[in-house]
């Protein structure tokens, strides 16, 4: 009678086991083991027992002990069951961002692992079990569907295998996949709201604001603002479920024309975009041209106004005839025209908006000098010892220099308060001089003595 010990063994893959083959007779002709496994017979006392070390056990095996005794030959099998945890436990790849309300299919694949009868696959959200199934097939596959909710944001989904060898006196061996962290999001179907100037002048700055409500999680939203090929750098302000992105936009002559202003909001794997056209225009102020900015009295002056080819101008309130980008007027310069403003107003229609630009030039008229009775009376009569201020105003452009002298030497203090004395009496020659020439006028001062009163 041949016996084997142990009759059943569960061992880790690649492991070793000691198997004892025994026979009931004292002097067996033969005692051994039949196995494809690498084996070593160990030293033992006696002849009716042999111990074999079987090594590198990779799969289930049934070594057979045999003996040959005088009463015949017999055999006995031992059952070696190999256990090993799966070589691969993996969740099928999924986009990390999932929209709220979508059905998400989690698929776990398990390669290897034995004995399969003791192997279970568990799908989890955090520590909560979603599904538990025995591992079937190679690779084993377990799937479950999850309706994505807002409160799933940041949740870790994983797949775990459980090789339960506790009934065999061993432990529970667990293998867990790399977690899949779910990022949930809500991006409303409404496009972002874009507020910007419809028209923008070259070499100026404008402000663009893009905003959207009903986002989750708003902090993860990416906002891209661009004008044509120019990426804008907005300052983003976040609310509970909204954002407002504000950017400053500068345009140059190269941007002139119709440009696309875009605001794109990207959240998860979705995006919403708003497009708007902005017309970039160049509209220099109209040019007011005077024949000469400074002319002498009596000179003929041409005043011209020139503006953008598509503009319509008015010169000093008078529209161009015909209506267009040029207007002019002719005048003979008079002293009254000195300091006169010539104002040109140009109007340009850009994308349905009227843009106004003004330019003003001043005319300087050179005239004089003048000394007339109104401003420089020819005769003054003042009581002696009275306080008087001699007044004589010379006119002209440029303002003339005025001197009033008696006998070529004694000055009349023009504009100063003086006490009237006999010395003040007499005829003064007032001379007004400027680059335009000079004029003279005689002024007589009479002093009334008290004795004549």
């Amino acid at each position: 009678q041949t016996s084997v010990s142990p009759s059943k063994v569960i061992l880790p893959r690649g492991g070793s086991v000691l198997v004892t083959c025994s026979t009931s007779c004292d002097q067996p002709k033969l005692l051994g083991i039949e196995t494809p496994l690498p084996k070593k017979e160990l030293l033992l006392p006696g002849n009716n027992r042999k111990v074999y070390e079987l090594s590198n056990v990779q799969e289930d095996s049934q070594p057979m002990c045999y003996s040959n005794c005088p009463d015949g030959q017999s055999t006995a099998k031992t059952f070696l069951t190999v256990y090993w945890t799966p070589e691969r436990v993996e969740l099928a790849p999924l986009p990390s961002w999932q929209p709220v309300g979508k059905n998400l299919t989690l698929r776990c694949q398990v390669e290897g692992g034995a004995p399969r009868a003791n192997l279970t696959v568990v799908l989890l959200r955090g520590e909560k079990e979603l599904k538990r199934e025995p591992a079937v097939g190679e690779p084993a596959e377990v799937t479950t569907t999850v309706l994505v909710r807002r409160d799933h944001h940041g949740a870790n989904f994983s797949c775990r295998t459980e090789l339960d060898l506790r009934p065999q006196g061993l432990e529970l061996f667990e293998n867990t996949s790399a977690p899949y962290q779910l990022q949930t999001f809500v991006l409303p179907a409404t496009p972002p709201q874009l507020v910007s100037p419809r028209v923008l002048e070259v070499d100026t700055q404008g402000t663009v604001v893009c905003s959207l409500d009903g986002l989750f999680p708003v902090s993860e939203a990416q906002v891209h603002l661009a004008l044509g090929d120019q990426r804008l750098n907005p300052t983003v302000t976040y609310g509970n479920d909204s954002f407002s992105a504000k950017a400053s936009v500068s345009v140059t002559a190269e941007d002139e024309g119709t440009q696309r202003l875009t605001c794109a909001v990207i959240l998860g794997n979705q995006s919403q975009e708003t497009l708007q056209t902005v017309t970039i225009y160049s509209f220099p102020a109209p040019n007011v041209i005077l024949t000469k900015p400074e002319v002498s009295e009596g000179t003929e002056v041409t005043v011209k106004c020139e503006a953008h080819p598509r503009a319509k101008v008015t010169l000093n309130g008078v529209p161009a005839q015909p209506l267009g980008p040029r207007a002019q007027l002719l005048l003979k310069a008079t002293p009254e025209d000195n300091g006169r403003s010539f104002s040109c107003s140009a109007t340009l229609e850009v994308a349905g908006q009227l843009i106004h630009k003004n330019q003003t030039r001043e005319l300087r008229v050179l005239y004089g000098p003048r000394l007339d009775e109104r401003d420089c009376p020819g005769n003054w009569t003042w009581p002696e010892n009275s306080q008087q201020t001699p007044m004589c105003q010379a006119w002209g452009n440029p303002l003339p220099e005025l001197k009033c002298l008696k006998d070529g030497t004694f000055p009349l203090p023009i504009g100063e308060s003086v006490t009237v004395t006999r010395d003040l009496e007499g005829t003064y020659l007032c001379r007004a001089r400027s680059t335009q020439g000079e004029v003279t006028r005689e002024v007589t001062v009479n002093v009334l003595s008290p004795r004549y009163e």
Partner: antibody, heavy 121, light 107 residues
Amino acid sequence: QVQLKESGPALVKPTQTLTLTCTFSGFSLSTSGVGVGWIRQPPGKALEWLALIDWDDDKYYSTSLKTRLTISKDTSKNQVVLTMTNMDPVDTATYYCARYPVTQRSYMDVWGQGTLVTVSS
Amino acid sequence: DIELTQPPSVSVAPGQTARISCSGDALGDKYASWYQQKPGQAPVLVIYDDSDRPSGIPERFSGSNSGNTATLTISGTQAEDEADYYCQSYDSPQVVFGGGTKLTVLG
């Protein structure tokens, strides 16, 4: 550290019984798997295995000398005793005791220095 | 009973590889060990369980065992390796030694 030392008579007369003691330290014969054995080496000749006793008191003997050998142990004294009856001049040899750390694998990792026993009248 | 057969002597030049064989019926089915013995000294275990090396034994000593032959290999042999080498195995219920090989390091 593991040490073994053989002791016994240096000279034995033919037909007498030889008693050798192996006193060891650094391990215990009550530890599972451990054994102590005897080996001899006649002058200028090869090693010859004699006997072995293990922690479980299982005894192993050389087939050719089995009838003359007895091995025993005193676990409390850390001693193993070998007796060999009917000594003959051909039994003149250095006798070694050695430790088997794993008896079933049969190798001897630490040896005593040996004691020379001469059989002569 | 199993008998272990070794060549009586092996010679090797310093730095070369020495190989000492030990043959016996189905020896590969059992564990083999190797001992080094220098004159006037007790044997020292150099290889056990076919190929394992005890601590303190130089890496140049290695062993193998399959079929009917166990082999002790000494790579880069040094003068101090000159000694007698014994293989050892078992045939339950007894332990067996080979006849020993004298290794001579030339020069």
